[in-house]
């Protein structure tokens, strides 16, 4: 039994790091393999992750990590019974994929503005909480040519769009994703999209 593609890991910088790898042949990951991980830190303990199958030769493991901070470094040991298949290390802060924002809501009751709000996916005491910026994607299923990305570089998870910039009488969808500038993260997954109908009409000019 051997590793074909070494484990690569990403962290949500909160509680979970996900490691994926490929084996040299079909493998029952949960029955045959164990990924042991330990924080390189005083009085830390070794933890065991039971991997799941991810396709025929692929395995994935979700490592539970508490209080993730920038200096953290983990040793990783992939075992098949008594055989050490691979040994490596993982620094979560250098491989961050933020959690997706949640609770995306569209407020259309503000006279001439479409207000989008969503929730920061991290609690206030998490180090990413004040570092997230967002991208909001708005598109229309009625108008396939219309798709816009709005970059939200301020901290407040809101976006205001003049309703007049959208076509009246058609439906729009929006979704949002996040990244953290100071941690040089990848983008999060997109949030679930939300749909609304733009009923705004320009005031009649005399």
């Amino acid at each position: 039994m051997k590793v074909l593609q070494e484990p690569t890991c990403v962290s949500d910088y909160m509680s979970i790091s996900t490691c994926e790898w490929k084996m040299g042949g079909p493998t029952n990951c949960s029955a045959e393999l164990r990924l042991l991980y330990q924080l390189v830190f005083q009085s830390s303990e070794t933890h065991t992750c039971v991997p799941e199958n991810n396709g025929g030769v692929g395995c994935v493991c979700h490592l539970l990590m508490d209080d993730v901070v920038s200096m953290d470094n983990y040793t990783l040991d992939l075992w098949a019974g008594q055989q050490l298949l691979w040994k490596g290390s993982f620094k979560p802060s250098e491989h961050v994929k933020p959690r997706a924002p949640g609770n995306l809501t569209v407020h259309t009751n503000v006279s001439d503005t479409v207000l989008l709000t969503w929730s920061n996916p991290y609690p206030p005491d998490n180090y990413l909480y004040n570092d997230l910026t967002y991208a909001v994607n708005i598109w229309s299923e009625n108008d396939p040519a219309y798709s816009r990305i709005h970059n939200v570089t301020y901290l407040k998870p809101t976006l205001r769009i003049p309703a007049s910039t959208l076509k009246s009488g058609i439906s729009y969808r929006a979704r949002v994703r996040a990244w953290a500038q100071h941690y040089n993260t990848t983008w999060s997954e997109w949030s679930p999209s939300t749909k609304w109908y733009n009923s705004y009409r320009e005031p009649f000019e005399q």
């Epitope: 009085s43 830390s44 209080d67 920038s70």
Partner: antibody, heavy 116, light 111 residues
């Protein structure tokens, strides 16, 4: 919100032991390391050791090896620091502090006075 | 015994800027991240800066940190009377064993 509530002030005689408690609330107790540090009157901060509340494993500063014992009780979310063979120079405010490489939450401190 | 050296005291008038230095060596600041703590009279220390230059939630941007080589600096702009306190730098030392260490402390007086 995170709170670390420490036990009250103590007056001890030289040679005695003192046990200071630090009760945690507002977070998952076993998910965060706890440090102990002390500060003698008018002096700076001195690290004493660390405990991992998850498994109870500890690491102590060389200076306090053999004299300090850190324990935890997960049922009450409390960590303890016991210092034995007290001497006058152990008179200090003792702090528990949550974190790993830096400490974001601190208890208010417990004054331990060692005097004959 | 602290191996991080800070000036014993600094002072400046309200509204001014002040910097506090923290000098170490290759086995500590040179090889680790620096944090800064503020200790108001009669209270526990409070984290101001971590990772050399990051601020926890709730710390105003008047406080900033930087690191260069084996030294670190805390800068406070727009000084307020409420900033009068002791300030400590902290980091990890790897010699002879891994351990957290603190600076000697700096008393900031707002004139």
């Amino acid at each position: 919100q995170v709170q670390l509530v420490q036990s009250g002030a103590e007056v001890k005689k030289p040679g005695a032991s003192v046990k200071v408690s630090c009760k945690a609330s507002g977070y998952a107790f076993t998910s965060y390391y706890m440090h102990w540090a002390r500060q003698a009157p008018g002096q700076g901060l001195e690290w004493m050791g660390i405990i991992n509340p998850s498994g109870g494993s500890t690491s102590y500063a060389q200076k306090f090896q053999g004299r300090v014992t850190m324990t935890r009780d997960t049922s009450t979310s409390t960590v303890y620091m016991e210092l034995s063979s007290l001497r006058s120079e152990d008179t200090a405010v003792y702090y528990c502090a949550r974190g790993k490489w830096w400490w974001q939450h601190w208890g208010k401190g417990t004054l331990v006075t060692v005097s004959s | 015994q602290s191996v991080l050296t800070q000036p014993p005291s600094v002072s400046a008038a309200p509204g001014q800027k002040v910097t506090i230095s923290c000098s170490g060596g290759s086995s500590n600041i040179g090889n680790s991240y620096v944090s800064w703590y503020q200790q108001l009279p009669g209270t526990a220390p409070k984290l101001l800066i971590y990772d050399n230059n990051k601020r926890p939630s709730g710390i105003p941007d008047r406080f900033s940190g930087s690191k260069s080589g084996t030294s670190a600096t805390l800068a406070i702009t727009g000084l307020q009377t409420g900033d009068e306190a002791d300030y400590y730098c902290g980091t990890w030392d790897t010699s002879p064993v891994d351990r957290p260490i603190f600076g000697t402390g700096t008393k900031l007086t707002v004139l």
